[in-house]
């Protein structure tokens, strides 16, 4: 027999409740706090959605980010000579996946063991503030990305140094920022041992007192503050910048450039499409939901939506792509298993050949292209 | 249309015992937290017990003034639910009603019309 | 447990009036509070749950309302089929637990 104070909390959002009932098991009897979840949470904490599904879309999210955002940090810190305020923007963006992918294998055995957190309170805030952190994070630095391409446009001029210590300036202001609005998510306990299902949950199963309106209040402010308005100025970025390629002259290589930013801004609004609109309205609603009616209807919707917001991690690298030229030469020469000081020996190699008679030697000094922006 | 019909009652002698039924229909029984709640004659609402869906492991919950007296017992397959009642004592003399818990735990709301119990020498 | 206290036994109102049912709780137990109407003879069934919101079917004359642990289920234009006790139950904490009822009587 369980005799305890069964209290109201709900998760991901679930409410479950302290309780004080007796509870027979046929395995003796404990004093304890209990927390208790209601039947549809039940469900969902013991369904394939969050057992099957989830750690599926993140182990796919884990294999493909981990490398991809890994090499992109890699080659915008060691292999780009200028450090253009994209390039900073991007690293930033790759650094902010890579530390919200990396806690992924923990967050994948979680759900594969029915959604059973056994490392820990500590483990179990990091996992939540990261996961949340990098949402927000990718939104500001895809903010940033989108303005200053299309500022490159309207003042095409040669890169300063004052321009990268204000990219640095912003990514650091970006990072305290991010810091600061997820601090509630370390602050506030995640783990709740449910002993109905036998199963510690993380973020899944909340107090009711604190989802009803804290957590309703808190991601309102995020999604208008962190996510409508940055948005706003992407689209805005992006509109304009559509207007100037519009009435820009085409030669080859503006058609070239026009083309990767159009290819750009595809993938930035699928971003927005498949992760980030999502995921932000399917948080007011859902909160919403609990704070007027006490439950949630779109629970379900709420779980998908926040689990597509991962693969951010996924299409950042698309951007990368599509921006820097560098990460374009490493990530097509990492496909082909070359390297890149092998491709340009090749290029030396056949340069040296065709122009043997007028010059006797041809070297590279340099195994790092220059990044057009 | 959510139906819940009990059965079983009638007068018994204290220190006996009954078993109560009720035949849930309109909704998918085994989806659903159920309960017992009781009336005693002229008085208030005061839960008795009450059963978890099969996520939940079937675990049942009981109050202080019933338990290791009483039993709860559901077959999902029949949506049924049950309450066994040994060593009855005058105060359990009451309406029971057999109730559902809403899915998401947000109160009680479907109850049966229920059946009466009468301990008596 | 908590305990739900519903002080009047009993409440008097003509047709057409409003009027108004308290409940207070123990102890903090958020917006967990539903209503429950009973008629004479028959079985409970609920009205509100949620403090505030009308289950399937509810006329909208039955409201609720909640400051801090007090509540409240409000008839409007009461008529003479409202007839009947009125229970409040605390849903946050289990048990789940019940005010001792309030009869609505028509003048």
């Known amino acids: 027999t369980i005799q305890g104070t069964n209290r109201s909390s709900k998760g991901r959002s679930l409410i479950g409740k302290v309780d004080g009932t007796s509870h027979v098991t046929g395995k003796g009897v404990t004093v304890e706090t209990v927390f208790s979840v209601d039947e549809f949470s039940a469900s969902v904490l013991t369904g394939k959605l969050t057992t099957v599904f989830l750690p599926i879309v993140y182990t796919i999210v884990f294999v493909v980010g981990l490398p991809s955002n890994g090499m992109a940090l890699w080659v915008f810190l060691f292999r780009t000579k200028k450090k253009h305020p994209a390039v900073i923007y991007m690293a930033n963006l790759a650094l902010a996946d890579l530390l919200s992918v990396i806690w992924f294998p923990l967050k994948i055995a979680y759900h594969i063991h029915g959604n059973n957190w056994i490392y820990g309170e500590a483990l179990c805030n990091v996992l939540i503030g990261f996961f949340y952190g990098n949402m927000y994070c990718s939104i500001l630095f895809m903010t940033c990305l989108s303005v200053q391409r299309y500022w490159v446009i309207v003042n095409p001029m040669g890169h300063s140094r004052k321009k990268a210590n204000i990219a640095i300036g912003i990514s650091l202001a970006i990072w305290l920022l991010i810091l600061l609005v997820t601090i509630p998510l370390y602050v506030v306990k995640q783990t709740i041992f449910i002993p109905a299902l036998n199963i510690t949950t993380c973020h899944d199963v909340l107090p009711e007192q604190l989802l009803v309106g804290d957590m309703f209040n808190y991601f309102l402010s995020l999604a208008i503050g962190v996510f409508l308005f940055p948005a706003f100025l992407t689209a805005s970025a992006y509109v304009l910048m559509i207007r100037m390629l519009r009435s820009s002259a085409m030669d080859e290589n503006s058609e070239k450039k026009r083309k990767r930013a159009i290819k750009l801004i595809v993938t930035v609004l699928a971003m927005y499409l498949i992760c980030f609109t999502p995921s932000n309205l399917l948080l007011v609603v859902h909160y919403f939901l609990i704070k007027s009616q006490g439950q949630s209807h779109v629970y379900a919707l709420y779980i998908v939506a926040l689990c597509l917001s991962t693969l951010n991690s996924c299409i950042d690298p698309f951007v990368y792509y599509f921006v820097s030229h560098d990460f374009r030469d490493h990530a097509k020469n990492a496909l082909l298993c070359r390297s890149v000081r092998t491709v340009k020996q090749m290029q030396v190699s056949l340069t040296s050949k065709k122009h043997s008679r007028k010059s006797s030697s041809y070297s590279s000094s340099s195994t790092t292209v220059k990044t057009s922006y | 249309e959510v139906q819940l019909i009990e059965s079983g009652g009638g007068l018994v002698q204290p220190k006996g015992s009954l078993k109560l039924s009720c035949a849930a229909s309109g909704f998918t029984f085994n989806s659903y937290a159920m309960h017992w709640v009781r009336q005693a004659p002229g008085k208030g609402l005061e839960w008795v017990a009450r059963?978890?869906?099969?996520?939940?492991?079937?675990?049942?919950y009981y109050a202080d003034s019933v338990k290791d007296r009483f039993t709860i017992s559901r077959d999902d397959s029949q949506s049924m639910l049950y309450l066994q009642m040994n060593n009855l004592k005058t105060e359990d003399t009451a309406m029971y009603f057999c109730?559902?818990?809403?899915?998401?735990?947000?109160?009680?709301?479907?109850w049966g019309q229920g059946t009466t119990l009468t301990v008596s020498s | 447990d908590i305990v739900m206290t519903q002080s009047h036994k009993f409440m008097s109102t003509s047709v057409g009036d409003r009027v108004s049912i308290t409940c207070k709780a123990s102890?903090?137990?958020?917006?967990?509070v539903a209503w429950h109407q009973q008629k004479p003879g028959q079985s409970p069934k609920l009205l509100i749950y949620w403090t505030s919101n009308r289950h399937t079917g509810v006329p909208d004359r039955f409201t609720g309302r909640r400051s801090g642990t007090d509540f409240t289920l409000t008839i409007s234009n009461v008529q003479s089929e409202d007839l009947a006790d009125y229970f409040c139950q605390q849903y946050s904490t289990y048990p789940f637990t019940f005010g001792s009822g309030t009869k609505l009587e028509i003048k």
């Open positions: 109730v559902r818990e809403d899915y998401y735990g947000s109160s009680y709301d479907y």
């Open positions: 102890q903090d137990v958020g917006s967990a």
């Open positions: 059963i978890r869906s099969k996520n939940v492991h079937y675990a049942t």
